[in-house]
Each structure stands twice: as structure tokens, then as C-alpha cells.
């Protein structure tokens, strides 16, 4: 018999995206006569969610049968909640009026917060490869989560990293949020098999964090080391010279032999030997017919790796006085069958 009061018992309700939200509202009286309406927000810009009197509200159902005698429950359920539904909902009693109904009394409001899962973290690395001892940046992004509170951690091979910076946007209130983090990682020679992991924890994930990974193999370049050696003679007039290309990554490699500065042969590394740390080795060899030379020969192994500036190593092959008296062609032979070159680049030659 008290004058009508609008009771919204819950100050706040939290719902997972995709679920239904029940917003409770009760009246203490049937008088004054007039419809109940639900709004999101207050003031002139408020959004009509449900009108007892008229309209079509496909996502809204009333919890009670409103036409049932002595019903004072005007709770509603909103289906398929999304982050865009977040806000404060007001149950408002209107008094019949002419020509328009007049707002009589409003409930205190119920704040609906929507728990939305963050998207799977996407980790991206640097655009260009870097060599060991250099620092590279990895970014991690995730979107669409709510509420705003979120935890992001970085790991490298299971070890937590500390050199990173994280931002959650926007700074103010929003229906959903995004996170962006940049981690700085110092590369080491053994990082070909390494992984960086971005791990995100959020209330919606129930203790099972989301992870995004990136392989350092996409970010690292390990330059090769070259060693040119002469093997024992197969025959008195043949010299066997090998170029050992060691511990390089990635595999793209082109090798050129030069004799006294003139290109003798170019080949592209194909069948490689993979080391435990993920780097590769390759060997090329050259058979030199010493009879063909009257003077000493400088043999140069020149390697262009992953499109970088060529590196080279030279070996001085001494021709004995006896051999200088005879002349013949040079014979070359590769230790491994060459394949078509992977790259054709302009190279700079360095002779050591």
C-alpha cells in the first residue's frame, strides 16, 4: 500500500559473452497505472531495451508472466549478450498520461558487465633477421576482452622475460579492450630452436591462459664460418681443396670458387647437414690439376649467405718447380651435387 517503489536489488551483474543476462526489478504497487520500461543509460540519450506497453524486442523476455494477477515482478532476460550490451540498466515505471505516458519512478540501476574472452594472442617478430648479440623486438596483440584487468607475460624457452612494455587500450571505459605488448630479446647463437611465448591471463579463462608463440628461427641469422683446407693428394698432379661452411642459418647459401680472383664455379647449397642447435654445415671441394699451373694459385671460397654481403676465405696453393714445367687443365669437383642457385645477388668479394 506504500506508494510504488521500483526495486532493482542488484547493483551489478556480470555475464559471460554469449550467455543471457537476467536483470531483476520489482514494483511494490500496481498504482499508478502505466507501463514498465527498461532503459540502458540515463538522461536524454538513454536506449529503450523493453517497453511493456508496445514494441518488438526479440532478445528480451520477461521472467514472470506480466499479465498474471498480482504480479509485481518486472525482471527481464536479455539473450546472447555481447560486450556492446555492457552498461547500466534502469527499470522505470511510467504513469499513464495524455498524450504521452509520464515517467513516474526509476530503479537505482543495475550495471551489466560482460565478461568477454581475449582473442588468441598473435605474436609477430621483426621484419628483418638479426644476428646473435643483437636485440630484436616481438609484439603480442589480443583483442575484444572485458573486463579491462588482464595479465600478460613473456617467456623465452620457459624463462620469463622482464624487458617488455604493455599497453591496454582504451584507457577509459569501453565495451571491450585490446592489449599490445612489445618484448626485447637478445639473440644468441643457439636461438634457432628457441621460442618466445606471450601468455595472457584473464578472468574469463578460468586459470587456463592463452598463449601465442613465435619461433626465433624466423628472426635470427647465424652467419657461417669458413675454413679452406688442402686435403691429402689423390694423385701426384692433383690438389684437393675443401671449403667447410659451418654453423649457418637459415639454409639459403651460394658458394663461388675463384682461382686467382677469377670465377671458377658457383654452386648453391642443397643437401645440408643439420646441427643439434639447428644451424647447418656444408662442404664444397675443388680438385686442382697442378700441371696446369706454372705459378702458385690463390684459391678463394666465397659465400653469400641469406642475401647478405659475401664473405670469403682464401688458400694459397703452392706449385712445385717440377710441376711448373708441365701444363694441363684444372679439374673441379664438388663434394656434393650442386643445385640451381637459390639467390642471384650482386656480391662484394673479400679476399683474405
Amino acid at each position: 500500500e506504500d506508494e510504488l517503489q521500483v526495486i532493482q536489488p542488484e547493483k551489478s551483474v556480470s555475464v559471460a559473452a554469449g550467455e543471457s543476462a537476467t536483470l531483476r526489478c520489482a514494483m511494490t504497487s500496481l498504482i499508478p497505472v502505466g507501463p514498465i520500461m527498461w532503459f540502458r543509460g540515463a538522461g536524454a540519450g538513454r536506449e529503450l531495451i523493453y517497453n511493456q506497453k508496445e514494441g518488438h524486442f526479440p532478445r528480451v523476455t520477461t521472467v514472470s508472466e506480466l499479465t498474471k494477477r498480482n504480479n509485481l515482478d518486472f525482471s527481464i532476460s536479455i539473450s546472447n549478450i555481447t560486450p556492446a550490451d555492457a552498461g547500466t540498466y534502469y527499470c522505470v515505471k511510467f504513469r499513464k498520461g495524455s498524450p504521452d505516458d509520464v515517467e513516474f519512478k526509476s530503479g537505482a540501476g543495475t550495471e551489466l558487465s560482460v565478461r568477454a574472452k581475449p582473442s588468441a594472442p598473435v605474436v609477430s617478430g621483426p621484419a628483418v633477421r638479426a644476428t646473435p648479440e643483437h636485440t630484436v623486438s616481438f609484439t603480442c596483440e589480443s583483442h575484444g576482452f572485458s573486463p579491462r584487468d588482464i595479465t600478460l607475460k613473456w617467456f623465452k624457452n620457459g624463462n620469463e622475460l622482464s624487458d617488455f612494455q604493455t599497453n591496454v587500450d582504451p584507457a577509459g571505459d569501453s565495451v571491450s579492450y585490446s592489449i599490445h605488448s612489445t618484448a626485447r630479446v637478445v639473440l644468441t647463437r643457439g636461438d634457432v630452436h628457441s621460442q618466445v611465448i606471450c601468455e595472457i591471463a584473464h578472468i574469463t579463462l578460468q586459470g587456463d591462459p592463452l598463449r601465442g608463440t613465435a619461433n626465433l628461427s624466423e628472426a635470427i641469422r647465424v652467419p657461417p664460418t669458413l675454413e679452406v683446407t688442402q686435403q691429402p693428394m689423390r694423385a701426384e698432379n692433383q690438389a684437393n681443396v675443401t671449403c667447410q661452411v659451418s654453423n649457418f642459418y637459415p639454409r639459403g647459401l651460394q658458394l663461388t670458387w675463384l682461382e686467382n680472383g677469377n670465377v671458377s664455379r658457383t654452386e648453391t647449397a642443397s643437401t645440408l647437414i643439420e646441427n643439434k642447435d639447428g644451424t647447418y654445415n656444408w662442404m664444397s671441394w675443388l680438385l686442382v690439376n697442378t700441371c696446369a699451373h706454372r705459378d702458385d694459385v690463390v684459391l678463394t671460397c666465397q659465400v653469400e649467405h641469406d642475401g647478405q654481403q659475401a664473405v670469403s676465405k682464401s688458400y694459397a696453393l703452392e706449385i712445385s718447380a717440377h710441376q711448373k714445367e708441365h701444363g694441363s687443365d684444372i679439374t673441379h669437383e664438388a663434394a656434393l651435387a650442386p643445385t640451381a642457385p637459390l639467390h642471384h645477388h650482386h656480391h662484394h668479394h673479400h679476399h683474405h
Epitope: V33, K96, F104
Partner: antibody, heavy 114, light 111 residues
């Protein structure tokens, strides 16, 4: 217990104003609306208007220009003011409580006469 | 304004018999599943007293001899059986629309 008591001038000269006070006890004006109803001698009841708990009012459109209802919650008093009285405003004036007019005062008789 | 027309204006009923009073509204007084029609009893020199609210709900303390029925525009107050104390004027009243309005009254006399 719930009580409502009207107090008025009794006699009012034509074209003058009427002021009636309804003093309530046993409940708070912040919880209940108060309505005003009048009844000319030997005739039926006429609803004049209401003041809701928040202080907003609704008046009978036939009398709206002449009526004013106000209240003082702290004094538990509701006031009816009516101007330009004529002889046909002679009536018993009642205040009543709530949505179904469950509780009434005993009324105060107002006679408009020169 | 909604006009309420009561009939008869007066009636005399023998003690122990049934009294039926009618109230017709100029337009429907139903809204949102309820009929906002109420019945009051007034004895001479006294303020009105609520008997029935929302067309059929009996007010606390009122004898079950009183009952109300009807919807939309046609409503009935029934007193069965009538007792001597029931002699009074009966008013229907609506609050579905502003202004709230009363019927003209029906005077019940007990024979």
C-alpha cells in the same frame, strides 16, 4: 495508528482563496501519496488531485488552474490551496492516503458564502 | 475523463437477500492485466471506506458477503446476504486514468 486530520477555515467568501492543511500521523509522507477528495452536501465524491512521495502532483483537469497541492514532510503536513472560490465549491474536503484510498480523514466542511 | 455511471441510483433490499449494484465506465479501465475499479461504502457523516479493490480483491477486514466482479467497462458489487449494517451509499471509483473519478453513488436501503 494511521490518522489523517483536515483543518480549514470553515467559511470562505466568494472569489477568495481556500487553504486546508492535512496533518498525518502513524506513517511518513515520504512513503505514501496523499489525495484530496471533496463532496458537496448530499452529492457524490470528486477527486481533486494527488501529491506523490517525491513531491510531484497531478490535478483534476477541471480544477487545475485553481488548485495547488504541496507538503512539508518534516511536519507531516500536506496543503491544499484553491483560489477563486464560488458557492458551488461548498463541500466536505477530505485528504486520503495511498493507492486505493484506504485511509481517510474525517473531512473539513468548507462553506463558500458572503 | 472516464465517466462512471452507477445503477440503480437507489435500491431497497430485504434483510438476508442479495443486493446487486452496477457500474459502467465510459471506456475500459483495464490495463496490463488488471481492472482498476474499486468500490467504497459511505455512511452518513463518515468518510468513505474501501471495500473492494482491483475489481474483485476484498479489502482486509471486510466481510466476505461483499464481492466484486467485472472487467473493462462493466462491473458489479454484490452483497449477499444483506445485513442491516449495510445500509449506506456505495461508490465505484477508477484510477486507470487521470483524473481519478467516482460514480454518482447507489443508496442501499434495507427493508
Amino acid at each position: 495508528q494511521v490518522q489523517l486530520k483536515e483543518s480549514g477555515p470553515g467559511l470562505v467568501a466568494p472569489s477568495q482563496s481556500l487553504s486546508i492543511t492535512c496533518t498525518v500521523s502513524g506513517f511518513s509522507l515520504s512513503s505514501y501519496a496523499i489525495h484530496w477528495v471533496r463532496q458537496p452536501p448530499g452529492k457524490g465524491l470528486e477527486w481533486l488531485g494527488v501529491i506523490w512521495t517525491g513531491g510531484s502532483t497531478i490535478y483534476n483537469s477541471a480544477l487545475m488552474s485553481r488548485l495547488n497541492i504541496s507538503k512539508d514532510n518534516s511536519k507531516s503536513q500536506v496543503f491544499l490551496k484553491m483560489n477563486s472560490l464560488q458557492t458551488d465549491d461548498t463541500a466536505m474536503y477530505y485528504c486520503a492516503r495511498g493507492n486505493y484510498l484506504r485511509y481517510w480523514g474525517q473531512g473539513t466542511l468548507v462553506t463558500v458564502s458572503a | 475523463n472516464i465517466v462512471l455511471t452507477q445503477s440503480p441510483a437507489s435500491l431497497a433490499v430485504s434483510l438476508g437477500q442479495r443486493a446487486t449494484i452496477s457500474c459502467r465506465a465510459s471506456e475500459s479501465v483495464d490495463s496490463y492485466g488488471y481492472s482498476y475499479m474499486h468500490w467504497n461504502q459511505q455512511k452518513p457523516g463518515q468518510p468513505p471506506k474501501l471495500l473492494i479493490y482491483l475489481a474483485s480483491d476484498l479489502e482486509s477486514g471486510v466481510p466476505a458477503r461483499f464481492s466484486g466482479s467485472g472487467s473493462r467497462t462493466d462491473f458489479t458489487l454484490t452483497i449477499d446476504p444483506v445485513e442491516a449494517d449495510d445500509a449506506a451509499t456505495y461508490y465505484c471509483q477508477q484510477n486507470n486514468d487521470d483524473p481519478w473519478t467516482f460514480g454518482g453513488g447507489t443508496k442501499l436501503e434495507i427493508k
